[in-house]
């Protein structure tokens, strides 16, 4: 029997590797029952995950499972870091595991490097 | 029934290339994290690496770093290791396993290929 | 690199009898999401490993209740109540907190 359970759809230890001036939309895929959650995004500092207010947020439903996206529009060097999403649902809160953007600075990469160049050259990323 | 079928190991002289596949069955691929271990002979297991099948990110044990590549085809449900100027030391058995990436609901194992590096 | 330690590294057991493997890590494995990714394997002779334990002390399916992980931070152990002839085998502790992903050397379980 399916879980009537809220659940979002974050991998842990997820990340992207992304370039500062493109833009990017960053997914929490959430399953719900009946009646949707209230989602919202937040940054992690620390230890202390900082809730994103006045942000581009959207929602998008397919089949089996909604999304809520963080829109960046631009993506900026301060972008960089985890993210992590939580679910409002019969005053539970229900959190995701944390995203992070890898965030490149064009200005100072001579060509794009890969992504997985990216996760694994630190200097190249702001923290 | 989940199933994980690693296949493509064999003999291989040192200093060549060697490409293993899992084929994998009864699970969502995109859902897991691949991971690539090995174990030689009569010795303990050590991680390779792991691909995201979702979107192709990768992560390595710093020693295979630039010798192996781990990659996966979601649509075929198949991933791959591909060894790049084997050594002697690299013969192993080599083991593809599959975890859940969300809750860690599961973590499947396949049989494992043996590959021997040999001149 | 987060080196695992575990003892002992041989472990013969009557049967019936409890079974005991320490695992120790050089760095604590609890999570910033506040979970500690620990992790016991059995590899019974000529076979593939298996998941036994996940998140210190969460047993796999089908997996039996005599087997049961505890601990926290940097000290684990997994026990079995009473030993039975399908336990021989090697019993890994692994970690998926830090990259990269290290393993104990392994404790071999036989029957005496």
């Known amino acids: 029997k399916e879980s009537c359970d809220v659940q979002l759809y974050i991998k842990r230890q997820s990340y992207h590797s992304i370039f500062a001036g493109d833009p990017f939309k960053l997914e929490c895929p959430v399953k719900y029952c009946a009646h949707r959650p209230q989602v919202t995004w937040c940054k992690l500092n620390g230890t202390t995950c900082v809730k994103l207010e006045g942000r581009h947020t959207s929602w998008k439903q397919e089949k089996n499972l909604s999304f809520f996206i963080l829109h960046f529009e631009p993506v900026l060097p301060s972008d960089n870091g985890s993210y992590r999403c939580s679910a409002n649902f019969l005053s539970a809160i229900i959190e995701s595991h944390s995203t992070t953007l890898y965030v490149t600075d064009v200005k100072s990469a001579s060509e794009r490097p890969s992504k997985d160049e990216m996760a694994s050259r630190p200097w190249l990323l702001y923290s | 029934e989940v199933q994980l079928v690693e296949s493509g190991g064999g003999l291989v002289q040192p200093g060549r290339s060697l490409r293993l596949s899992c084929t994998t069955s009864?699970?969502?691929?995109?859902?897991?994290?691949i991971h690539w271990f090995r174990q030689a002979p009569g010795k303990g297991l050590e991680w390779v690496g792991r691909?995201?099948?979702?979107?192709?990110?990768?992560k390595y044990t710093a020693s295979f770093k630039g010798r192996a590549t781990i990659s996966a085809d979601g649509s075929k449900s198949i991933a791959y290791l591909q060894m790049n100027s084997l050594k002697t030391e690299d013969t192993a058995v080599y083991y593809c396993?599959?975890?859940?990436?969300?809750?860690?609901?599961?973590?499947?194992w396949g049989q494992g290929t043996l590959v021997t590096v040999s001149s | 690199d987060v080196v695992m330690t575990q003892s002992p590294l041989s472990l013969p057991v009557t049967l019936g009898q409890p079974a005991s493997i320490s695992c120790r890590s050089s760095?604590?494995?609890?999570?910033?999401?506040?979970?500690?990714?620990l992790n016991w394997l059995q590899q019974r002779p000529g076979q593939s490993p298996r998941r036994l334990i996940y998140?210190?002390?969460k047993r796999d399916s089908g997996v039996p209740d005599r087997f049961s992980g505890s601990g926290s931070g940097t000290d684990f152990t997994l026990k079995i109540s009473r030993v039975e002839a399908e336990d021989v085998g090697v019993y890994y502790c692994?970690?998926?907190?830090?990259?990269?992903?290290?393993f104990g050397q392994g404790t071999k379980l036989e029957i005496k």
């Open positions: 396993a599959s975890y859940e990436g969300y809750y860690e609901r599961f973590g499947y």
């Open positions: 009864g699970f969502n691929i995109k859902d897991t994290y």
């Open positions: 691909n995201d099948p979702a979107n192709g990110n990768t």
């Open positions: 760095q604590s494995l609890l999570d910033r999401d506040g979970k500690t990714y």
């Open positions: 998140l210190v002390s």
């Open positions: 692994w970690q998926d907190t830090h990259f990269p992903y290290t």
